[in-house]
Interface confidence: medium
């Protein structure tokens, strides 16, 4: 809503941005606060309890001063005035400093990611060209689910070096398509680590691991827990032998019984010989009966 243009009353012209302004009516703020003064003293606004509608006036003044978008010197000090910005406003900005990003994320801390924040992050990441480690560190600190909100295409711009910033909880809501993109990057990032350390780091990315990597892990006494196993790709688990799964899970193999009706365990059981399943001594049922011939139909389809 436009604030009526009225002359500033005598003696009310603002010499600086200070607490006295909270007692100004909206039209007085419009008439008595110079936009250039506001821009140079933006850092003070955050400490002054302006009302919701007084902030509309201050925003309007900045919009008039910077119709092409605010400079970063102003953006960095927006404070809670940021909550008044629309995604359209933010698309005009060029935010390059991580400090600016942190300052604005701090304002929204504890809330869901708003459209404004999503736009801000998008502008920042696009400006940098890739999601570097420092940025990822910052974003996942404020929004643990951030990584999993990106599309597989966006994730492809994450350099392997950034994977070191990822914590297990950051991947909690990722789907298999996202893990398919992240797993090879993690494998590359952690390739110089020794067996047990490598497994600790790679574990939360294994939902994107292919069969051959799972076979290799089964040779390393990793003792994968059932929660991790249940998140593996079904197509990666199916070709594993009973012996390989037993080695992969170690003492956790007993947990298969409780999961025998759930994927990928259910589908894996259907592919195993019942004889082999019986060697586990867990009472797993549903394997291929003894004496039956197993045909690999996938090979036949590939040939026809």
């Amino acid at each position: 809503r436009e604030v009526e243009k009225t002359a500033c009353p005598s003696g009310k012209k603002a010499r600086e941005i200070d607490e006295s302004l909270i007692f100004y009516k909206k039209w007085e703020l419009e008439a008595c606060v110079d936009a250039a003064l506001l821009a140079t003293q933006m850092d003070r606004v955050n400490a002054i309890p302006f009302t919701y509608e007084q902030l509309d006036v201050l925003k309007h003044k900045l919009d008039e001063l910077y119709p092409q978008g605010y400079p970063e010197s102003v953006i960095q000090h927006l404070g809670y005035l940021f909550l008044k910005m629309s995604p359209e406003d933010i698309r005009k900005w060029n935010v390059t400093s991580l400090e600016t990003l942190k300052a604005l994320l701090e304002v929204n801390k504890g809330h869901e990611m708003s459209p404004q924040v999503a736009t801000l992050i998008d502008r920042f990441v696009k400006g940098r060209g890739q999601l570097d480690k420092d940025t990822l560190d910052t974003l996942t600190a404020f929004y643990p689910g951030y990584l999993c909100s990106l599309s597989p295409e966006e994730l492809s711009s994450v350099p392997p070096s950034s994977i070191w910033a990822v914590r297990p909880q950051d991947l909690d809501t990722c789907d298999p398509r996202q893990l398919d993109v992240l797993y090879p990057k993690a494998r590359l990032a952690f390739q110089n680590m020794n067996g047990s350390e490598y497994f600790v780091k790679i574990q939360s990315f294994l939902g994107g691991a292919p069969t051959e990597d799972l076979k290799a892990l089964s040779q390393q006494n990793v003792s994968m827990d059932l929660a991790t196993f249940m998140k593996l790709r079904t197509d990666a688990v199916l070709p594993l032998t009973v012996a390989e799964v037993q080695k992969l899970l170690g003492p956790h193999v007993e947990g298969l019984k409780a999961e025998e009706r759930h994927r990928p365990v259910r589908d894996w059981i259907l592919r195993q010989r019942q004889d082999d399943l019986d060697t586990l001594g867990l009472g797993l049922q549903g394997g291929i009966p003894n004496g039956y011939l197993v045909l690999d139909l996938s090979m036949q389809e590939a040939l026809s």
């Epitope: 007692f23 009516k25 400490a47 309890p49 302006f50 919701y52 404070g79 809670y80």
Partner: nanobody, 119 residues
Framework: QVKLEESGGGLVQPGGSLRLSCAAS????????MAWFRQAPGKEREIVAV????????YYAESVKGRFTISRDNPKNTVYLQMNSLKPEDTAVYYC????????????WGQGTQVTVSS
């Protein structure tokens, strides 16, 4: 319409403490600035403390700086005034107020709670 109800007032000795509460009802006040005003007998109503709608910015009258603290709990629609090191001159009726506009227009008021500082 916003309804404001103050509580927590009473008689206290000089140097003592009180915590005033103001519960808002009728609509959420998360986008409103909240304030405490006071009016001593024979004097004009004066502003004591203000907190903005995010809980970030605060303002205190010079006479209470360092002694009083204003805070808010948006989910509970409540604002508080913690008053420490009370002095006899703090004796007044304390009013809670809310506005989205400015303190000189469109302000909602509570009924007030009496604070008496006396030995």
């Amino acid at each position: 319409q916003v309804k404001l109800e103050e509580s927590g007032g009473g008689l206290v000795q000089p140097g003592g403490s009180l915590r005033l509460s103001c519960a808002a009802s009728g609509r959420t006040v998360s986008a409103y600035n909240m304030a405490w005003f006071r009016q001593a007998p024979g004097k004009e109503r004066e502003i004591v403390a203000v907190i903005n709608w995010t809980g970030g910015g605060t303002y205190y009258a010079e006479s209470v700086k360092g002694r009083f603290t204003i805070s808010r709990d948006n989910p509970k629609n409540t604002v508080y005034l913690q008053m420490n090191s009370l002095k006899p001159e703090d004796t007044a009726v304390y009013y809670c107020a809310a506005t989205r506009t400015s303190w000189t227009e469109n302000t909602y008021w509570g009924q007030g709670t009496q604070v008496t500082v006396s030995s």
